[in-house]
């Protein structure tokens, strides 16, 4: 897939890995919150 224009920003290159890790962490936290919510609703 075509890279977005922001990929030309040096920041994208220097922080690519940490941004991906931060996003993965954010998604994991969101999934955890969703599971907790489902548990509460399930009860």
């Amino acid at each position: 897939s075509e890279e977005p224009p922001i990929s030309l920003d040096l920041t994208f290159h220097l922080l690519r890995e940490v941004l991906e890790m931060a996003r993965a962490e954010q998604l994991a936290q969101q999934a955890h919150s969703n599971r907790k919510l489902m548990e509460i609703i399930g009860k």
């Epitope: 922001i6 920003d9 920041t11």
Partner: antibody, heavy 118, light 112 residues
């Protein structure tokens, strides 16, 4: 011409929060990350964090995690930084900055002075 | 964190003189891609910082050629060949090779 126009000075009480803005013009807002800096009076510069205007993804310097929250409004090409639980240590000038393909902080706003005082 | 140490803290010069500012990093700032993301900024009194040099030795657009950057690894230098009144202010070195990105403490260039 690239311009980053920051909001005016803020005088806030300890424990309160403040939200400052940085309006970008002269380029496509979503083509570049926005970064924020802190400069305490007479001191050096500290990098706070960065935000991707496309999706709101953020990455913070650990020293500012929980202190600063970065957001954007794409419709108005404006970046925001909120600082919470303010103390005298947070009194400083805060800058928004933008890079290029070759350098990290090529363009700077004029700064927003935050004074925390009872 | 990478500590950036600048010397001297203050540099008194006569206009027209050459000035030299040193910046040392606490570890190598060569990035895994082979580049060294060392930048120099000038903050004039009452103004926002301005980019002078990126990747050790490249002048940003509009920066006069009297400014030159050099160095490698952990040791870097900014030279101003003929200091003008508009060059007075505080100079900062900065590294973007390792997160968190960090600045030096600054060197104040002032008239003798």
């Amino acid at each position: 011409e690239v311009q980053l126009q920051q909001s005016g000075p803020e005088l806030v009480k300890p424990g309160a929060s403040v939200k400052m803005s940085c309006k970008a013009s002269g380029y496509t807002f979503t083509d570049y990350f926005m970064k924020w800096m802190k400069q305490s009076h007479g001191k050096s510069l500290e990098w706070i964090g960065v935000i991707n205007p496309n999706n709101g993804d953020t990455f913070y310097n650990q020293n500012f995690k929980g202190k600063a929250t970065l957001t954007v409004d794409k419709s108005s090409s404006t970046a925001y930084m909120q600082l919470n639980s303010l103390t005298s240590e947070d009194s400083a000038v805060y800058y928004c900055t933008r890079g290029t393909a070759r350098a990290l902080f090529a363009y700077w706003g004029q700064g927003t002075l935050v004074t925390v005082s009872a | 964190d990478v500590l950036m140490t600048q010397t001297p803290l203050s540099l008194p010069v006569s206009l027209g003189d050459q000035a030299s500012i040193s910046c040392r990093s606490s570890q190598s700032i060569v990035h895994s891609d082979g580049n060294t993301y060392l930048e120099w900024y000038l903050q004039r009194p009452g103004q926002s910082p301005k980019l002078l040099i990126y990747k050790v030795s490249n002048r940003f657009s509009g920066v006069p050629d009297r400014f030159s950057g050099s160095g490698s690894g952990t040791d870097f230098t900014l030279k101003i060949s003929r200091v003008g009144a508009e060059d007075l202010g505080v100079y900062y070195c900065f590294q973007g090779s390792h997160v968190p990105w960090t600045f030096g403490g600054g060197t104040k260039l002032e008239v003798k």
